[in-house]
């Protein structure tokens, strides 16, 4: 007569994190007397998951009524699965004794846990950069399993190709992380642009996760300056305007100098916004010509977003 066999019909089981995993096990005989125990892993370091004879296993329930007289089904359900539960589970028959001795083990069932990646977090450079410069963006997502994952970068819907991606750790793990760095060349039109990191994983059922970064937080568009003299408003007054165009962000301070001496300083307030997200602003200076014997050099000096000042000058002719 053939002795007791321990049958684990499933070589592998895959479960989504948070769900319950059912691990099947049947025995072909009720003898020898002794409990069934479930372990994760093999060898001396194996972890006890369930013992029919004794112990408290709050996450484990038996699928069949284990006290039922003719029960030979020792399948278990493990609730609230996390990636840390992944591994190979063995159903083991023990023979009654002091202590109980291992009699026969099932072939094992590998439990893999499908865990969703966290929402991708995209971060840009610490300091702003100007158009034509290349900046780096990083994207990170954590806690997913299995390891296979796809990451794509987009700028305004256009896929980027200049990026490097790593999935860690390289070896077997309960869960994984992805880290990607993309290089983006800034243009003057990028104030309204977005960089998107898109992560696709088996757990997301075709609906990828996205993380975004607004280039408005990364770009600095320096202004262009134009100083013009307006027609004389009164016999002894000249209106000089300084047009500050196409700048971003708004933080800007303008100083008027007359022959190198500070005349007035003001901060950009009532700006107008261009379609591309940059700003325009205009400042004017009324110059009292009668107060000057010689020609006057007027300078519009602009300090934008904490950068070194740029200036534009205009020579005002004072006729005798």
């Amino acid at each position: 007569e053939e002795e007791l066999q321990v049958i684990q019909p499933d070589k592998s089981v895959s479960v989504a994190a948070g769900e319950s995993a059912i691990l099947h096990c049947t025995v072909t005989s009720l003898i020898p007397v002794g409990p069934i125990q479930w372990f994760r892993g093999a060898g001396p370091a194996r972890e006890l998951i369930y013992n029919q004879k004794e112990g408290h296993f709050p996450r484990v329930t038996t699928v069949s009524e284990s006290t039922k007289r003719e029960n030979m089904d020792f399948s278990i359900s493990i609730s609230n699965i996390t990636p840390a539960d992944a591994g190979t589970y063995y159903c083991v028959k023990f023979r009654k004794g002091s202590p109980d001795t291992e009699f026969k083990s099932g072939a094992g069932t590998e439990l893999s846990v499908r865990a969703k990646p966290s929402a991708p977090v995209v971060s840009g450079p610490a300091a702003r950069a100007t158009p034509q410069h290349t900046v780096s963006f990083t994207c990170e997502s954590h806690g997913f399993s299995p390891r296979d994952i796809t990451l794509k970068w987009f700028k305004n819907g256009n896929e980027l190709s200049d990026f490097q991606t790593n999935v860690d750790p390289v070896g077997e793990s309960v869960s994984y992380s992805i880290h990607s760095t993309a290089k983006v060349v800034l243009t003057r039109e990028d104030v309204h642009s977005q960089v998107i990191c898109e992560v696709a994983h088996v757990t997301l059922q075709g609906d990828p996760l996205r993380g975004t970064a607004n280039l408005s937080e990364t770009i600095r568009v320096p202004p262009t300056l134009e100083v013009t003299q307006q027609p004389v408003r009164a016999e002894n007054q000249v209106n000089v305007t300084c047009q500050v165009r196409k700048f971003y962000p708004q933080r800007l301070q303008l100083t008027w100098l007359e022959n190198g001496n500070v005349s007035r300083t003001e901060t950009a307030s009532t700006v107008t916004e261009n379609k591309d997200g940059t700003y325009n602003w205009m400042s004017w200076l009324l110059v009292n010509v009668s107060a000057h014997r010689d020609d006057v050099k007027l300078t519009c000096q602009v300090e934008h977003d904490g950068q070194p000042a740029v200036s534009k000058s205009h020579d005002l002719k004072v006729s005798a």
């Epitope: 002795e3 009720l30 003898i31 020898p32 004879k53 030979m72």
Partner: antibody, heavy 115, light 111 residues
């Protein structure tokens, strides 16, 4: 589902007897069969259990004198070196104890050891 | 070997009475619950009532219940019926698979 015993009778001291326990309505292949005896007017006494794959175990007093075996339909208990104190009704029962209790019993067969 | 001591050895009771029989093991039974109760009527084979200390066997009336753990166990008949007059045995298992011992029995008689 039942167990039917046979093979009891009168035997002389030192003699042998083979008891049979036939199952009907279920297979013995996945169950242990235990033997329990009851001397006249006395209580129950566990003798031994016969399992699958050659697994058998006996009460300390029965070791060496009593030997069990089984097929998928019939269990046997060989009684040897019989003594007067072995006189009893011998029952076979399906089960091996703990979570596999003795739930189906035979009607019993009387073994009388006397000269 | 494990020794099972039943008490009382006999008792007289009336129909409708609550009856309690105890069984004490000389050491903890296997798994703290390797204890079964059997009923035997004269000229008949024993019948399983309770196993794993407290699990009611199939077809057994719910007036029978078992309790206890380790070394001390109880069989309770909540309301004695005429068909319950019989002898009751506990069967305890020690840690060794060849260590199964019946108690000496408790005879429940009509008062």
């Amino acid at each position: 589902r039942q167990l039917v015993e046979s093979g009891g009778g009168l035997v002389q001291p030192g003699g042998s007897l083979r008891l049979s326990c036939a199952a009907s309505g279920f297979s013995l292949s996945s169950h242990g069969i235990s033997w329990v005896r009851q001397a006249p007017g006395k209580g129950l006494e566990w003798v031994g259990t016969i399992g699958t794959g050659g697994i058998t175990y006996y009460a300390s007093w029965a070791k060496g004198r009593f030997t069990g075996s089984k097929t998928s339909s019939t269990a046997y208990m060989e009684l040897s070196s019989l003594r007067a104190e072995d006189t009893a009704v011998y029952y076979c029962a399906r089960g091996s104890a703990w979570n596999d209790p003795f739930d189906i019993w035979g009607q019993g067969t009387l073994v009388t050891v006397s000269s | 070997d494990i020794v099972m001591t039943q008490s009382p050895s006999s008792l007289s009771a009336s129909v409708g009475d609550r009856v309690t029989i105890t069984c004490q093991a000389s050491q903890s039974v296997y798994g703290n619950n390797d204890l079964a109760w059997y009923q035997q009527k004269p000229g008949q084979a024993p019948k399983l009532l309770i196993y794993l200390a407290s699990t009611l066997a199939t077809g057994v009336p719910s007036r029978f219940s078992g309790s206890g753990s380790g070394t001390d166990f109880t069989l309770t008949i909540s309301s004695l019926q005429p068909e319950d007059f019989a002898t009751y045995y506990c069967l305890g298992g020690g840690d060794d698979e060849a260590d199964n011992t019946f108690g000496q029995g408790t005879k429940v008689e009509i008062k």
